[in-house]
């Protein structure tokens, strides 16, 4: 007649700083009342009390005030525990004891995790490098948990396991900073990449460094891209320009062209084996096939989204190899601001009013300026908030609190810093008493 208590078999994985639910359930008999229930959560190893419910009442958290039950669900047999703002130190086993007439218990494991940052790479020495020099490449990634796995490889995918030293240090919160050092002898040129994996989240963070010693290989392909970022409006098409100079007798069969995201190395589009291999990027990219033979390797990106913003690398390989990166800056114009007033009727000089200026669906974040009817800037008592929607576009709400004079005009200017596009709205408050908006 022991009470059956059920918990998940697999550990509960929780990110540091988030809330975790440790599930625990029992099957209440007909006529069961909470007055009969004794529920205790405790740390399995130390038996430290975490949370309890007894004598028909939640006895509260005994664990740094970060735990809670689900009181409305207890009567249905849900004895789960909510653990707030998870810390590394919370990792371990928690036991759920349930006693009604009979008694049962089960333990659930909490596995804490935190993603590692994108690795930063440093080189020592970092100038006047020549083939044959020994260099030390350091790959650093921060604030992850648990300890990371680190892998190195060269530009051909060959694993580099010799001459690697990896150290991991925990900070006060128990999060690890990982530093992995690779010592290599330089060839004519080389790419070295470091991959830091969080084994619990199966999350990979990687970076690479390409070292071209001073005596660069002869005849490398010169790849040209615009220096300035390409600015594209959300929803429109953008052309990322890239060109090379084909030699006499050049044929497309010799060309390997790869576009990829500079940071993640994600393939975007490729042309190999004499043909367009198509888009690997949500089917929104295209080359200019008729212009490739003339050295035009540009990429067309259709229906641009905020998430496309960043650096794209154009790799061109014929006999030799060259690459260059072009930045895409995404933008969206802000709508004409709408103005609201609170309170909006029976206004008199001396009243304090709140004027809200709202402008929608712009990118990137806006700059907001207020001024009065004489062009005098109003900077005190302004609060501006910007919220991104699912598409990454921002809605901006700016609130100005002012004391009314006999009459006054208040204008709000919303600027898109990339497009240098200004959208403005104004409100004029006159008369006494006043009503806003004016009645017909």
């Amino acid at each position: 007649g022991a009470l059956e208590v059920q918990v998940p078999e697999d550990p509960v994985v929780a990110l540091v700083g988030t809330d975790a639910t440790l599930c625990c359930s029992f099957s209440p008999e007909p006529g069961f009342s909470l007055a009969q229930l004794n529920l205790i959560w405790q740390l399995t190893d130390t038996k430290q009390l975490v949370h309890s419910f007894a004598e028909g009442q939640d006895q509260g958290s005994a664990y740094a005030n970060r735990t809670a039950l689900f009181p409305d669900l207890l009567a249905q047999g849900n004895a789960s525990l909510r653990l707030q703002r998870v810390r590394v130190a919370d990792e371990g086993s928690f036991t759920c004891f349930v006693s009604i007439r009979d008694f049962g218990s089960a333990a659930v494991s909490l596995q804490v995790a935190a993603p590692y940052s994108k690795p930063s790479m440093t080189l020592e020495p970092n100038k006047d490098l020549r083939p044959g020099d020994t260099v030390t490449i350091t790959c650093s990634s921060y604030q992850g948990y648990p300890e990371a796995e680190v892998f190195w490889q060269d530009g051909q995918g060959v694993p580099l396991t010799g001459n690697v030293t990896t150290s991991q240090m925990a900070n006060e919160q128990g999060l690890f900073d990982v530093h992995s050092i690779l010592r290599v002898v330089l060839g004519a040129n080389g790419t070295y990449s470091c991959l830091v994996r969080n084994p619990v989240l199966q999350q990979d963070a990687h970076s690479s460094v390409t070292i071209t010693p001073q005596r660069s290989p002869t005849g490398a392909v010169e790849v040209q891209v615009p220096e300035d970022p390409v600015v594209a409006l959300v929803g429109t098409d953008a052309t990322l320009r890239c060109s090379f100079s084909p030699e006499p007798g050049f044929s497309l069969a010799q060309l390997n062209l790869i576009w990829q995201l500079t940071d993640t190395k994600q393939l975007v589009h490729s042309f190999t084996e004499g043909r367009d291999q198509g888009s690997a990027y949500a089917n929104r990219t295209a080359l200019f096939p008729d212009l490739l033979a003339q050295g035009n390797a540009s990429l067309r990106l259709q229906r641009v989204r905020v998430a496309d913003e960043g650096s794209f690398t154009c790799f061109v390989s014929i006999r030799d190899f060259g690459s260059a990166a072009v930045s895409l800056q995404v933008a969206a114009p802000y709508s004409k601001p709408s103005m609201t007033l609170e309170p909006n009727k029976d206004l008199r000089p001396g009243d304090t009013v709140t004027i809200t200026c709202s402008s929608y669906r712009g990118y990137p974040e806006a700059e907001v300026f207020w001024q009065d009817g004489q062009g005098v800037p109003l900077t005190g008592n302004v609060t501006t908030s910007q919220m991104a929607n699912e598409q990454g576009l921002f809605d901006v709400h700016s609130v100005l609190r002012v004391v009314l004079g006999a009459n006054g005009t208040y204008s709000c200017l919303v600027r898109n810093p990339v497009l240098q596009q200004d959208a403005h709205g104004s409100v004029t408050i006159t008369g006494q008493p006043m009503t806003f908006p004016p009645e017909a």
Epitope: F151, Q156, G274
Partner: antibody, heavy 121, light 106 residues
Framework: EVQLVQSGAEVKKPGSSVKVSCKAS????????IHWVRQAPGQGLEWMGY????????DYAQKFQGRVTLTADKSTSTAYMELSSLRSEDTAVYYC??????????????WGQGTTVTVSS | EIVLTQSPDFQSVTPKEKVTITCRAS?????MNWYQQKPDQSPKPWIY???NLASGVPSRFSVSVSGTDHTLTINSLEAEDAATYYC?????????FGQGTKLEIK
């Protein structure tokens, strides 16, 4: 079209050597490593080693160390695998394969058609 | 040396059935690749960098990872999937393959 074309079948006596060729076309031969993988009858795939045709760096599986030699001729875009001191258990299909991709995603994207080597007295 | 152990060695399955093949690594690998081989043919790239389908591979194939276990799943087996599947790693020397899993259609 990217292709690796291997030389034809060979029948060899125990104790002798065999040299298999693998001619690459349709891509820059020096940009990717060439690996050799063998498969005994009814068995799985077994890695033998690789060569970087550009630097001519090689690395061999312990099992074949001292018995296998990998070479590459840039002028003809051809890789070679020579296996010496042949014994009957070396009877297998020998494949060359290109290890391709971009950092850090690499895999064997193109394989030769295979060369059958039979070792028999 | 990282040893890759595939299970099962052999599986006989009816069409439309869900199939799983597990490749267990003796220690962590950076990426796992999978190849398909049919009788008297060279191996073909099937899945690269753990979970990316190679060109032309149907979407019924997928891979999930738990610790050092990489599991290849075929959601609804078709006759053309009858083949031997190999996993492969090169996170550290030597490069190694799993022993292979042969899928046969009942």
């Amino acid at each position: 079209e990217v292709q690796l074309v291997q030389s034809g079948a060979e029948v060899k006596k125990p104790g002798s050597s065999v040299k298999v060729s693998c001619k690459a076309s349709g891509y820059s031969f020096t940009s990717y490593t060439i690996h050799w993988v063998r498969q005994a009858p009814g068995q799985g795939l077994e890695w033998m080693g690789y060569i970087n045709p550009n630097s001519r760096n090689t690395d061999y599986a312990q099992k074949f160390q001292g018995r296998v030699t990998l070479t590459a001729d840039k002028s003809t875009s051809t890789a070679y695998m020579e296996l010496s001191s042949l014994r009957s258990e070396d009877t297998a299909v020998y494949y060359c394969a290109r290890y391709s991709g971009s950092t850090p995603y690499w895999y064997f994207d193109v394989w030769g058609q295979g060369t059958t080597v039979t070792v028999s007295s | 040396e990282i040893v890759l152990t595939q299970s099962p060695d052999f599986q006989s399955v009816t069409p439309k059935e869900k199939v799983t093949i597990t490749c267990r690594a003796s220690s962590s690998v950076s990426y796992m690749n999978w190849y398909q081989q049919k009788p008297d043919q060279s191996p073909k790239p099937w899945i690269y960098a753990t979970s990316n389908l190679a060109s032309g591979v149907p979407s019924r194939f997928s891979v999930s990872v738990s610790g050092t276990d990489h599991t290849l799943t075929i959601n609804s087996l078709e006759a053309e999937d009858a083949a031997t599947y190999y996993c492969q790693q090169w996170s550290s020397n030597p490069l190694t393959f799993g022993q292979g899993t042969k899928l046969e259609i009942k």
